[in-house]
């Protein structure tokens, strides 16, 4: 896993993160975990990074992922509202210049690579739709979530707004 | 434009369940949070709960075992209701709209004008 | 629960005055922190969200900073529409708390 080391290298100059001229309206560290407590960690196996959802020992250090939280409209005409409303957008960096992508081809949650401007599939939509949990929904995809398969992360099609409590897409950020 | 108006009884009795209405407009109820705050007089503003856009709803610890939030997405309403009240429930009811959709973390600029609620006999 | 706390409690200040207002969270609530003002028998109003992030509408006296556990709100040249109650409130964990409010009166 990455540990805190590796995040800490971040600075400010390394996150003007601009999407399209977009600076993030806030940044910071937290470790992510499944409403079930097991946390989200990351390794580098053979030249690539993999993702894992596991139970971690009693004192190991949990992962950390730079979370940049992004501002952007909500057309009235996609929210069936009267007016146009504010939505927040997040990225998930667990280690410099890598973000967490989502692939809706494979359905899948993957590392890339990549320099800024970031794409479109590297932005999911912030839900906190249960208590002190948050759910992911992919920008490329509405309706598409982050959630937990067999201990990895995957594209999660939900189909109705009651669902959005479902266990599997619901997640815990923590700065400690 | 965004509208928020809270409705119910300006006089409940001790021990009685107090009952209020949140109506909205401008904007759907499966795409927004709405908030219960009071204030009661003299004192601060006083967070009571929320119901998300998906349904789930969250409440002061304090107040947990009273309260209960619910809504109708269809006719644009939540509802308020606080159970075995007494005279330190007497505050003004304001109900408020998240600031970003399906999330709450931006607070609330949008607030009804609040409604007086007493409990006396 | 989260505990926020607000200070000072009052404070009586000129037109013109540069006025800060401080609130203190019981534990890290990242940027999640709004501050509202509040005018006798009106509603509250939202002036900053996201810790400095300015409300649609609100003047550019207003002011927010901090993260983590310590914010402050700043009015850099008090107006006199601007007496008035001020409030932060954490949005990281429910329940959501409000702070015990600053009354800021004329001097």
């Known amino acids: 896993a990455f540990g805190i080391s590796g995040v800490q290298k971040y600075t400010r100059a390394l996150h003007d993160s601009s999407i399209t001229g977009i600076s993030p309206i806030t940044e910071y560290l937290a470790s992510l975990s499944t409403y079930n407590d097991q946390s989200i960690t990351f390794a580098l196996e053979d030249e690539s990074y993999e993702i894992y959802v596991e139970d971690l020992k009693k004192d190991e250090k949990k992962d950390k992922v730079l979370l940049s939280y992004y501002e952007s409209q909500h057309p009235s005409n996609e929210s069936g509202d009267g007016v146009d409303g504010k939505m927040l957008m997040v990225t998930l960096s667990p280690t410099k210049d890598f973000w967490l992508h989502a692939n809706n081809k494979e359905h899948s949650v993957e590392l890339h690579k990549c320099e800024k401007p970031l794409p479109d599939q590297a932005f999911f939509v912030l839900h906190n739709m249960h208590s002190n949990c948050v759910s992911f929904e992919c920008k490329t995809d509405p309706g598409v979530f982050i959630g937990v398969k067999d201990n990895h992360l995957a594209l999660i099609k939900v189909d109705s707004s009651e669902n959005l409590c479902t266990e599997n897409i619901l997640f815990k950020l923590s700065e400690t | 434009q965004v509208q928020l108006q809270e409705s119910g009884p300006g006089l409940v009795k001790p021990s009685e369940t107090l009952s209020l209405t949140c109506t909205v407009s401008?904007?759907?109820?499966?795409?927004?949070?709405v908030h219960w705050i009071r204030l009661p007089p003299g004192k601060g503003l006083e967070w009571i709960g929320v119901?998300?856009?998906?349904?789930?709803?969250d409440y002061n610890s304090a107040l947990m075992s009273r309260v209960t939030i619910s809504k109708d997405n269809s006719k644009s309403q939540v509802s308020l209701k606080l159970s075995s009240v007494t005279a330190a429930d007497t505050a003004v009811y304001y109900c408020?709209?998240?600031?970003?959709?399906?999330?709450?973390?931006?607070?609330?600029?949008?607030w009804g004008q609040g409604t007086l609620v007493t409990v006396s006999s | 629960d989260i505990q926020m706390t607000q200070s000072p409690s009052s404070l009586s200040a000129s037109v013109g005055d540069r006025v800060t207002i401080t609130c203190l969270a019981s534990?890290?609530?990242?940027?999640?922190l709004a501050w509202y003002q509040q005018k006798p028998g009106k509603s509250p109003k939202l002036l900053i969200y996201a810790a400095t992030r300015l409300a649609d509408g609100v003047p550019s006296r207003f002011s927010g900073s901090g993260s983590g556990t310590d914010f402050t709100l700043t009015i850099s040249s008090l107006q006199p529409e601007d007496f008035a109650t001020y409030y932060c409130q954490q949005l990281y964990n429910t329940p959501y708390t409000f702070g015990q409010g600053t009354k800021v009166e004329i001097k």
């Open positions: 401008g904007f759907s109820l499966t795409n927004y949070g």
């Open positions: 408020a709209r998240d600031h970003y959709f399906s999330n709450s973390y931006g607070g609330s600029p949008y």
């Open positions: 119901i998300r856009a998906g349904g789930s709803s």
């Open positions: 534990q890290t609530i990242a940027t999640w």
